[in-house]
């Protein structure tokens, strides 16, 4: 039989982060190689990664079609013998389905991971100081150009802003529905920054990790009385 | 200074689909905010249906998901409201609105500051 | 979702005296979401305060909001003829946002 001696991959995982979506399987395969499907609940099975010797595959232009919708994938294990007659065999020579382990589903706009954000700019004029999050690019696309994560998300993305005073340890939060703060400081400290991305109404990937600390008086700043 | 105006049919029938346009005036759609659709049955309150953002991110009301799509057009200015299989407790006055952001609190939140001046759509045969 | 009430349904009361308008929410509301609005017959709402505490501009310092949590109120210290209307509060913080079902003030 043409599915002889192969083994069904296992622990499926899908790896996604602001929507660049990999799916990760084991084992390292011996004397196989792998092909992957991708559907929607309702859609048809499209054919990804054939016949690969890797472990993981790239999903993203798959999922950003749309990113609301929940997917579901299966990896298919195939003789080696048979990955050679090209992508229409991927089935074995007797034309019986090779052995596959599905997904768990995955909804892009639900479970992809907040990435790292980064502070983009800060401005102080006088006691106040203006704190800007860098909007990153996903590769969301809508009439042939890049969303950013912002365009995605809308207002179910909020950042919170983490700063203290260089000389202290205490630090004050605030939150905003946009890309920008305005916080008050005291004249004459230097404070530090640190954002978070986070989605409020998720159950799950609620948070990103800490953007790196940006502190005034370094070169992202800009100061004017 | 933005102005709202929504157009569309004053009379839908039962099960039909009710479609609103809200044109922008005096101000690019694509400007950082967001446009709403709310509506009010006669002599009741208000009632939020969605909104969407230039970029074609939307939410909407959970009780009207199934019936309601709310689309952008950047380049005529305008953000469109659909309502299929309408009935006669869809009948109210629709209004269209911006989200615009406000400071408050060290960050800046969304509040409907300019509306439409709201049109009437009864669901009648 | 998040229900909004408020009270008392209906205000009868005279030019010059104050009045004072409650909002309660049915789950905890951060005041950063909480806006209140007036609206005459016949004309769209009106956006007055928002961030439960601060005037919208070109709004009269005679009207105030106060509050958090579950209970948020506006205060209009001195009525004006023009202040007659209907007063809504509502959340923009949890979808869907809502409104409370509104507070008329009516002269005596």
């Known amino acids: 039989s043409g599915t002889t001696n192969t083994v069904a991959a296992y622990n499926l995982t899908w790896k996604s982060t602001n929507f660049k979506t990999i799916l990760e399987w084991e084992p390292k395969p011996v004397n196989q190689v792998y092909t992957v499907q991708i559907s929607t609940k309702s859609g048809d099975w499209k054919s990804k990664c054939f016949y690969t010797t890797d472990t993981e595959c790239d999903l993203t232009d798959e999922i950003v079609k749309d990113v609301k919708q929940t997917y579901l994938a299966r990896v298919f294990s195939v003789p080696w013998r048979n990955s050679t007659h090209g992508k229409e065999t991927l089935f074995g020579t007797h034309g019986e389905e090779p052995p596959y382990e599905n997904s768990p589903e995955f909804t892009p706009y639900l479970e992809t991971n907040l990435g790292q954000p980064t502070i983009q700019s800060f401005e102080q004029v006088g006691t106040k100081v203006n704190v800007t999050v860098e909007d990153e690019r996903t590769l969301v696309r809508r009439n042939n150009t890049f969303l950013s994560l912002r365009d995605v998300f809308g207002k179910d993305l909020i950042y919170t802003l983490y700063y203290w005073k260089s000389s202290s340890s205490g630090k004050k939060t605030a939150k905003t529905n946009t890309n920008e703060f305005l916080i008050d400081v005291d004249k004459g400290e230097n404070y530090c920054f640190s954002v978070q991305a986070v989605i409020p109404s998720r159950t799950v990937n609620r948070k990103s990790t800490d953007s790196p600390v940006e502190c005034m008086g370094q070169e992202k700043g800009e100061f004017r009385e | 200074q933005v102005q709202l105006q929504e157009s569309g049919p004053g009379l839908v029938k039962p099960s039909q689909t009710l479609s609103l346009t809200c044109t922008v005036s005096?101000?690019?759609?694509?400007?950082?905010?967001?446009w709403s659709w709310i509506r009010q049955h006669p002599g009741k309150g208000l009632e939020w249906i969605g909104e969407?953002?230039?970029?074609?991110?939307?939410r909407y009301n959970p009780s009207l998901k199934s019936r309601v799509t709310i689309s952008v057009d950047t380049s005529k200015n305008q953000f469109s409201l659909k309502l299929s299989s309408v009935t006669a407790a869809d009948t109210a006055v629709y209004y269209c609105?911006?989200?615009?952001?406000?400071?408050?609190?060290?960050?800046?939140?969304?509040?409907?500051?300019?509306w439409g001046k709201g049109t009437t759509v009864t669901v009648s045969s | 979702e998040i229900v909004l009430t408020q009270s008392p349904g209906t205000l009868s009361l005279s030019p010059g005296e104050r009045a004072t308008l409650s909002c309660r929410a049915s789950e905890s509301v951060d005041s950063s979401y909480l806006a209140w609005y007036q609206q005459k017959p016949g004309q769209a709402p009106r956006l007055l305060i928002y961030?439960?505490?601060t005037r919208q501009t070109g709004i009269p310092d005679r009207f105030s909001g106060s509050g958090s949590g579950t209970d948020f109120t506006l205060t209009i210290s001195r009525l004006e003829p023009e202040d007659f209307a209907v007063y809504y509060c509502?959340?923009?913080?949890?979808?869907?946002?809502?409104f409370g079902g509104g507070t008329k003030v009516e002269i005596k």
């Open positions: 509502q959340q923009a913080g949890v979808v869907p946002y809502t």
């Open positions: 609105a911006r989200d615009a952001p406000y400071y408050y609190g060290g960050g800046y939140y969304y509040y409907m500051d300019v």
């Open positions: 969407i953002y230039y970029s074609g991110s939307t």
């Open positions: 961030g439960a505490s």
């Open positions: 005096g101000g690019s759609i694509s400007s950082g905010q967001y």
